[in-house]
């Protein structure tokens, strides 16, 4: 019984969670593994260490669930001394979903749009900065925020601990066995652990990150983690691990920001939002039309509708204002979701038909999903009309006209023109049929 049972103290500084089971309720420590500040890993049981190269690493593996998560690291930019998280690859059954640092998502190497649902996996985007992969049937949630060099693997509380392997360790509330190698033996040396779970992609070479460590400790900015600003979060998640990591990297501005962002993310996951960024300190810049919010509730609103479920916890990032929804990376009014954009840039309503400029033989229709369907209209065989005297039938096609038409045009060459009469007493002959081809006087 959870009300009477002892609440455990969790080794990863997390707050224990209730797990309702058939035989009652029990307390357990959440299985959360985080990566932050470019290279720091905090295991399920709270051990922490640094990745030392731009390479690929197995973070988490569960053979029983046919699930594997791989982190791909690389230089932040060509020749850069810093390493960055380039992508997170989630393999499940026959699917390989890769979340890239440029916020693109590929499934088995093919680019897909988000939200994406497939093979028991759901992918959502939050605040234009964070991707989330949910396994509703397993209860796992994985997130990747490349802008902060941060990932979070949150396993279902019902996960059978001993079936997890990789750099994130074994979630069994025992930090001593987190550094487990593939053969089941445990090492105390984190460098051996990292080496063990390093995998090489075809054509990729693993290179050490030659980042210069901090020689002068000045962790004044890390103090933010200990301020009353985070007091509510301190109640659910002790900041000690993150403060220690921050102090190690205090001379690198991005890394200080990344560590604090990672702690703030865990706070949000636990229901506590902290507005810690300022214009002068770790500011997050948003693309045009989006606005920053440190605590956005509800599902991201996309034109495609909410085809997948999403987390009930708040998120940070760049969002559309309340009256707008996301469409291809920018915010649009909701009515724009059903509108189609023609080649000329003109908006057309759902089921509206139009003839595009300079393509008079096409008729285009705006269908659902903002798809434009254009068909070419066939031309009937043109029939030559019966023309009047001195007229000949000729085919004509204007630029804005699809099918050619016959028209009667004057043909003086083939015409028997009457003589112009000679008038007396200074009178002039007058035309009795102006506009016609054969004049009458």
């Amino acid at each position: 019984n959870c009300d009477r049972g002892l609440r455990p103290s969790c080794p990863n500084s997390q707050s224990p969670v209730k797990v309702e089971e058939t035989c009652g309720c029990r307390w357990t420590c959440p299985c959360v593994c985080t990566g932050s500040s470019t290279r720091h890993i905090v295991t399920f049981d709270g051990q922490n260490f640094k990745l030392t190269g731009s390479c690929s690493y197995v973070l988490f593996q569960n053979k029983e669930q046919d699930l594997e998560v791989i982190l791909h690291n690389g230089a932040c930019s060509p020749g850069a001394r810093q390493g960055c998280m380039k992508s997170i690859e989630v393999k499940h059954s026959a699917l390989s979903v890769e979340l890239h640092s440029d916020m693109e998502v590929t499934v088995n190497g093919r680019l897909v749009s988000v939200p994406y649902v497939g093979g028991n996996m759901e992918v959502n985007v939050y605040g234009a900065i964070m991707h989330e992969v949910r396994f509703n049937h397993l209860g796992h949630i994985f997130t990747f925020t490349p802008q902060n060099n941060e990932f979070q693997l949150q396993l279902s509380p019902k996960t059978f601990a001993s079936k997890t392997y990789g750099l994130c360790g074994i979630c069994d509330e025992n930090g001593a066995n987190d550094f487990m190698l593939r053969d089941g033996t445990v090492t105390t040396d984190w460098k051996t652990l990292v080496q063990e779970w390093t995998v090489q992609r075809p054509g990729q070479t693993c290179q050490p990150i030659l980042e210069e460590q901090c020689l002068v400790p000045d962790s004044s900015h890390c103090q933010v983690l200990l301020l009353p600003l985070f007091a509510e979060c301190h109640k659910v998640l002790a900041p000690a691990t993150f403060y220690a990591i921050c102090q190690q990297d205090s001379c690198h501005q991005e890394q200080v920001c990344e560590v604090i962002a990672s702690y703030a993310h865990l706070c949000r996951t636990n229901g506590v939002c902290v507005d810690w960024r300022t214009p002068d300190f770790c500011a997050m810049s948003c693309p045009p039309s989006l606005v920053y919010n440190h605590c956005e509730h509800g599902c991201p609103r996309h034109c495609d509708g909410n085809v997948s479920s999403c987390g009930d916890h708040p998120s940070e990032g760049c969002f559309c204002p309340p009256d707008k929804v996301m469409l291809e990376g920018s915010c649009v009014p909701e009515e724009a979701c059903t509108q189609c954009i023609g080649e000329d840039g003109v908006q057309h309503q759902f089921l509206e038909a139009w003839v595009p400029d300079h393509q008079p033989c096409q008729i285009c229709t705006c269908l659902s999903g903002r798809k434009v369907n254009c068909t070419t209209q066939p031309c009937p065989t043109a029939k030559a009309p019966t023309c009047g005297l001195c007229e000949v039938a000729r085919l004509r096609q204007n630029a804005d006209q699809c099918c050619p038409e016959y028209e009667c045009v004057c043909d003086p060459v083939s015409c028997d023109l009457p003589p112009v009469p000679h008038c007396e007493r200074g009178l002039q002959p007058t035309l009795t049929n102006p506009g016609e081809c054969r004049p009458n006087f």
Epitope: E212, V216, P217, Q247, H252, Q253
Partner: antibody, heavy 113, light 112 residues
Amino acid sequence: DVQLQESGPDLVEPSQSLSLSCTVTGYSITSGYSWHWIRQFPGNKLEWLGYIHYSGTTTYNPSLHSRVSITRDTSKNQFFLQLNSVSTEDTATYFCGREGYHWGQGTTLTVSS
Amino acid sequence: DVVMTQTPLSLPVSLGDQASISCRSSQSLVHSIGNTYLHWYLQKPGQSPKLLIYKVSNRFSGVPDRFSGSGSGTDFTLKISRVEAEDLGVYFCSQTTHVPLTFGGGTRLEIK
């Protein structure tokens, strides 16, 4: 790679103020690290004067605190040392540096009337 | 202030010999975050000091592996396994754990 270059006068009169500049190339002084001024007296003794953090905060050697000031111009990627009320004892080679990894070549200053 | 005492003041060696320089601090250099910020520099005539070893035992990039650092708390040592001509100059230890940052008085490595 990062490079630092000191510049300033060769000679300053006693009781005057000394101003030195350090121009940094290859790295932004607002991106990270602390940026230091150190001096070396004739006879090799090294003395740390102070630093300006990438965030703009400063830390000084208490023995010089009332006389020393370090500022920066982020648009030019430069930081500066000002030492007031100099005396002949401030005759030294002045170095600027990043953390301790990289130092400039130094500029030699003589305080003399 | 933390006083850094280097010994010897001068160290005459033959090329190929091992050299050892000691540095002692007046108080512990272990920072509250667990790191020990003790570093070693080499200064050649007319040049600025160049970093050799940082945080007691880490070789800076490009520094030959004949240089090694060791020690803890208040006692530290720099060793050169086989002295080469390019190693001659003045060696300084430095601590950045406490403000003000301080330097040792220097050890001149010279040919016997």
